[in-house]
Amino acid sequence: SERCDDWGLDTMRQIQVFEDEPARIKCPLFEHFLKFNYSTAHSAGLTLIWYWTRQDRDLEEPINFRLPENRISKEKDVLWFRPTLLNDTGNYTCMLRNTTYCSKVAFPLEVVQKDSCFNSPMKLPVHKLYIEYGIQRITCPNVDGYFPSSVKPTITWYMGCYKIQNFNNVIPEGMNLSFLIALISNNGNYTCVVTYPENGRTFHLTRTLTVKVVGSPKNAVPPVIHSPNDHVVYEKEPGEELLIPCTVYFSFLMDSRNEVWWTIDGKKPDDITIDVTINESISHSRTEDETRTQILSIKKVTSEDLKRSYVCHARSAKGEVAKAAKVKQKVPAPRYTVELACGFGAT
């Protein structure tokens, strides 16, 4: 057979679907690998072929499109399961070809089981809601294309195991779930079950997402440097270890990059010759506000080092701040024995 552009196994698109539910899987070639869509390919005389490798097998085999009730079918660039079975798990390949052209990609499909409370090994998308921010919504994801707009499905929302009908400041509104006010108590897994009829059968789509309530932009502030501050002086003798923590609080900001760095005499530590190490730790509050601590350490400080300027810097989407640490050389304690002897000698 002629050469085929093989994009390999696209593990980035690990597709997970629930057992005994419809699944529609688009061939990833047109979405991520080729610069043209299925319609263009089809009108150019290219054919889309599907095959698969069962779980724990090496043998590629064609997909059986002659199952009862057309359980597996293909429509344009979509592979349909109505519904899935557990043993549909495997690696699926779609190949686009004609006599002169060939391109293919494989992707893993995992059919997973869920319990009566919708717990499963499914990786859940996370939707962030701002705390105490007014009405916000989540939408039942990935249900487009399963039924025509003329079909009116029934949608039932659950928080964890419980049907949402009158609690927690949450109003189910069809495909949307509206939060009158989002609070920490709203954190959790939300499931929409979409029920629709098709050809005399009833199908269910189950979609679960995790809601995480985060800090509101209304309350967001520029970074706050708690340390170094004006109350602490780092007083060291040459030869001692100098440890200066830079502790910075960052309000949660969607898609903000929080940065903390030290400068020594206006330069990044990497750009100077002294032996300095920096260790960073990060902690988060319940609303994903962030506290970053960078500890600057000089194992054996010299008197030169104790004259340098040590400045902690922080930056977020809300602004940039800096604070200098108060570093000084310890003055040696007075030698009282000598002074007293001198004193007595003078009388």
Epitope: G134, N166, F167, N168, I171, P172, L180, I181
Partner: antibody, heavy 125, light 113 residues
């Protein structure tokens, strides 16, 4: 559990057009900090019920108003006093009504399972 | 704005009979509807929420049904104590810029003969 309404005196409030009045509603037997909404509903003499607005009674003062309110009314709450209040400003004769406070249980927007006894507000010159 | 239209008013039936009150929403409010009973000189009393769930302490003679834009309150085995005005209350969060829109129906007076 009850909601005790006050404001405008025992006989209700007689206010001149353009005037202001504050109506309050005190919770007893339950705590406002238990995350309830305090909502206000009014009823003109011989007419139907009309939703005014709701305030979230716990830590935040999230408020929602009916579109017709147009900023003339303000909802507030005092957790320490277990009280929710409705400030009425720029009153007109059309605002003459019995004003009820109600507790929305669960934050569903429509489940008003506990009501105050109502305060009659009369706007007249 | 959300508009709730109630019919008919008034409605009358004999003791032991059945009364059906309809409520129509101008928008799809799914199941976000409650029914209230109000007697003269009293505040309203919650009967049903989430379109069909009976509030605590309410007799099972009261039942609610419907979703979307069409809702019904049914009182079966009518008693003289059921003489009152009944209101539906709908809620939706996607019409107003404000975000939360509640609207009562105009009320239906039930007369018990």
């Amino acid at each position: 559990q009850q909601l005790e309404q006050s404001g405008g005196g025992a006989e209700g409030g007689l206010v001149k057009p353009g005037g202001s009045l504050e109506l309050c509603c005190k919770a007893s037997g339950f705590s406002l900090s238990s995350a309830y909404w305090i909502c206000w509903v009014r009823q003109a003499p011989g007419k139907g019920l009309e939703w005014v607005g709701c305030i979230y009674a716990d830590s935040s003062s999230i408020t929602y108003y009916a579109s017709w309110v147009n900023g003339r009314f303000t909802l507030s709450r005092d957790i320490d006093q277990s009280t929710g209040c409705l400030q009425l400003n720029s009153l007109t004769a059309a605002d003459t009504a019995m004003y009820y406070c109600a507790r929305d249980y669960g934050g569903s927007g429509y489940n008003f399972n506990l009501w105050g006894q109502g305060t009659l507000v009369t706007v007249s010159s | 704005a959300l508009v709730m239209t109630q019919t008919p008013s008034p409605v009358s039936a004999a003791v032991g009979g059945t009364v059906t009150i309809s409520c129509q929403a101008s928008e799809d409010i799914y199941s976000n509807l409650a029914w209230y009973q109000q007697k003269r000189g009293q505040p309203p009393k919650l009967l049903i929420y989430y379109a069909s769930t009976l509030a605590s302490g309410v007799p099972s003679r009261f039942s609610g049904s419907g979703s979307g834009t069409e809702f019904t309150l049914t009182i079966s085995g009518l008693q003289s104590d059921d003489a009152a005005t009944y209101y539906c209350l709908g809620v939706c969060t996607y019409i107003n810029a404000n975000g939360w829109d509640n609207a009562f129906g105009g009320g239906t007076e039930v007369v018990v003969k």
